[in-house]
């Protein structure tokens, strides 16, 4: 978890002037209690947008948003501290609004946005926006908080992250997988811009089950300049056993951005359909 | 290939606990939460919590506290769901899925049955 | 906790026809909703997340739309395999909840 950049971040707006600090999540007003605090955010929203750096690399942001509910607490509150959990790392960024002056009702409701969290393809977060000063030990909670799920790399726009493009997702491999005779399968795919090398991982399955019956991995040396954006044909050999018949085919590539940790793509060949009626079984067998 | 196997059925007796097994190949535990989710025979989908491998943290239902563990062993890149002190509604699939918000891949679930 | 409410509990469509399928919450969840696909004996499939967007292989009839608390999976030409029971599920806040499900079945 990171902020984008590290320019000036502003919250300021007509009749507030405020401004933007790092905060360690732990703001002082857990350690000295006030006796009037202002009461929660409404209307909390967080959307995924779409932010350049200074060095024009694009990333995905939370875009998170709130309101000020309409009660006298507004006259108490300094502030909000806003904190992004990363749920399966627990690593959490916050940053404090923090007000510096004092926050008068006004014809329209308050309403305050922030969009510098970088955020991960495909990873969970909770956002939380505490008002400040946070409740006494027993007050009622005045903080607010939602779940944001970040699509993976296939979602369009995520495609063209920095994050995204650096793990290969523009290359589009337009896999094709045919069933040949003699219990083979014939595996198609276009190779990227790259002298790189490519492993193809073929699983297979029995018709409706989750375990694999078998598996087997194709090494696809780095091809020439020439050979880039062309198709590349393997022909895999599968292991004759009755019944397993689902294909995953999964094409693995190593490039240089991404190593080891390339989007992998995959296609998958169905077991031949059954027919829905069996053949009728004669109720007596001729003796000729 | 992410696949998700889990343990196999089993019966318990009310007041005993059961622990299921969730075996995580294709990708690294660490990666990604573990979720928990069972259904009830004839019934809805119902949250029990996760766990994350990386961190060790875990988030449960409030309805299990107390009753429930989740622990992960990323040497074995296996999960795992106890469960304390059965009782007759507990008789349910128990699902590993994984993520922690969205389960994008689930295990093929595991019959517990609780009967005395 | 969020109530997640699925209608109609059971559908009857005839295969090719399109199928409407309907999930409210109890409050506001913005678009962190998802639908699953279960067939029997089998686990839950993720079709849809974010309340719209399909996961990495599902096919492009179903299609999910809304946000805040009406949902609707769009299945827009019945196959046989997606004869099954559909669930929503809303991830905005703790504890995650299931709605009871839809159950498609042949006309």
């Known amino acids: 978890l990171r902020l984008l950049d590290h320019r000036a971040l502003v919250c300021s707006q007509p009749g507030l002037n405020c401004t933007v600090k790092n905060s360690t999540c732990l703001d002082d007003s857990w350690i000295h209690p006030r006796n009037l605090t202002p009461s929660s955010p409404k209307d909390l929203q967080i959307q995924l947008h779409f932010a350049h750096t200074q060095q024009g690399d694009l990333f995905p942001v939370a875009h998170i948003e709130w309101t000020l509910q309409t009660d006298a607490s507004i006259l108490y509150l300094e502030g909000a501290e806003l904190s992004v959990l990363q749920l399966n790392t627990n690593e959490r960024l916050c940053v404090r609004f923090e007000f510096l002056s004092k926050l008068r009702h006004h014809h329209r409701r308050w309403r305050f946005t922030f969009s510098h969290f970088v955020v991960d393809p495909d990873q969970e977060y909770e956002v939380t926006v505490h008002h400040l000063p946070k409740p006494i030990p027993d007050g009622d909670p005045n903080h607010q908080s939602k779940n944001f799920l970040v699509p993976d790399c296939e979602h369009a726009r995520m495609k063209v992250t920095t994050p995204c493009m650096s793990s290969g997702s523009l290359w589009d491999p337009n896999i094709t997988v045919e069933t040949l005779e003699a219990h083979q399968l014939r595996v198609s795919f276009t190779l990227w811009n790259e002298s790189t090398h490519y492993q193809i991982l073929l699983t297979s399955f029995p018709h409706m089950e989750n375990h694999s019956c078998f598996e087997h991995m194709h090494h696809i040396p780095a091809p020439r300049p020439e050979e880039f954006h062309q198709r590349s044909n393997v022909t895999l050999t599968l292991r004759n056993l009755k019944g397993c018949c689902r294909h995953q085919v999964q094409i693995q590539p190593f490039f240089s951005s991404c190593l080891n940790d390339c989007l992998r793509h995959s296609a998958t060949v169905s077991c031949p359909e059954m027919p829905d009626t069996p053949e009728p079984i004669p109720d007596y067998m001729p003796l000729w | 290939q992410v696949q998700l196997v889990q343990s196999g059925a089993e019966v318990k007796k009310p007041g005993a606990a059961v622990k299921v097994s969730c075996k995580a190949t294709?990708?690294?535990?660490?990666?990604?939460?573990i979720s928990w989710v069972r259904q009830a025979p004839g019934q809805g989908l119902e949250w029990m919590g996760w766990i994350s491998a990386y961190s060790g943290n875990t988030k449960y239902a409030q309805k299990l506290q107390g009753r429930v563990t989740m622990t992960t062993d990323t040497s074995t890149s296996t999960a795992y769901m106890e469960l304390r002190s059965l009782r007759s509604d507990d008789t349910a699939v128990y699902y590993c899925a994984r993520k922690q918000l969205v389960f994008d891949y689930w295990g093929q679930g595991t019959l517990v049955t609780v009967s005395s | 906790e969020i109530v997640m409410t699925q209608s109609p509990a059971t559908l009857s469509v005839s295969p090719g026809e399109r199928a409407t399928l309907s999930c409210r919450a109890s409050q506001s969840v913005s678009s962190n909703l998802a639908w699953y696909q279960q067939k029997p004996g089998q686990a839950p499939r993720l079709l849809i997340y974010g309340a719209s967007t399909r996961a990495t292989g599902i096919p492009a009839r179903f299609s999910g739309s809304g946000s805040g608390t009406e949902f609707t999976l769009t299945i827009s030409s019945l196959q046989s395999e997606d004869f099954a029971v559909y669930s929503c599920q809303q991830y905005d806040n703790w504890p995650l909840t299931f709605g009871g499900g839809t159950k498609v079945e042949i006309k």
């Open positions: 294709g990708y690294t535990l660490t990666s990604y939460g």
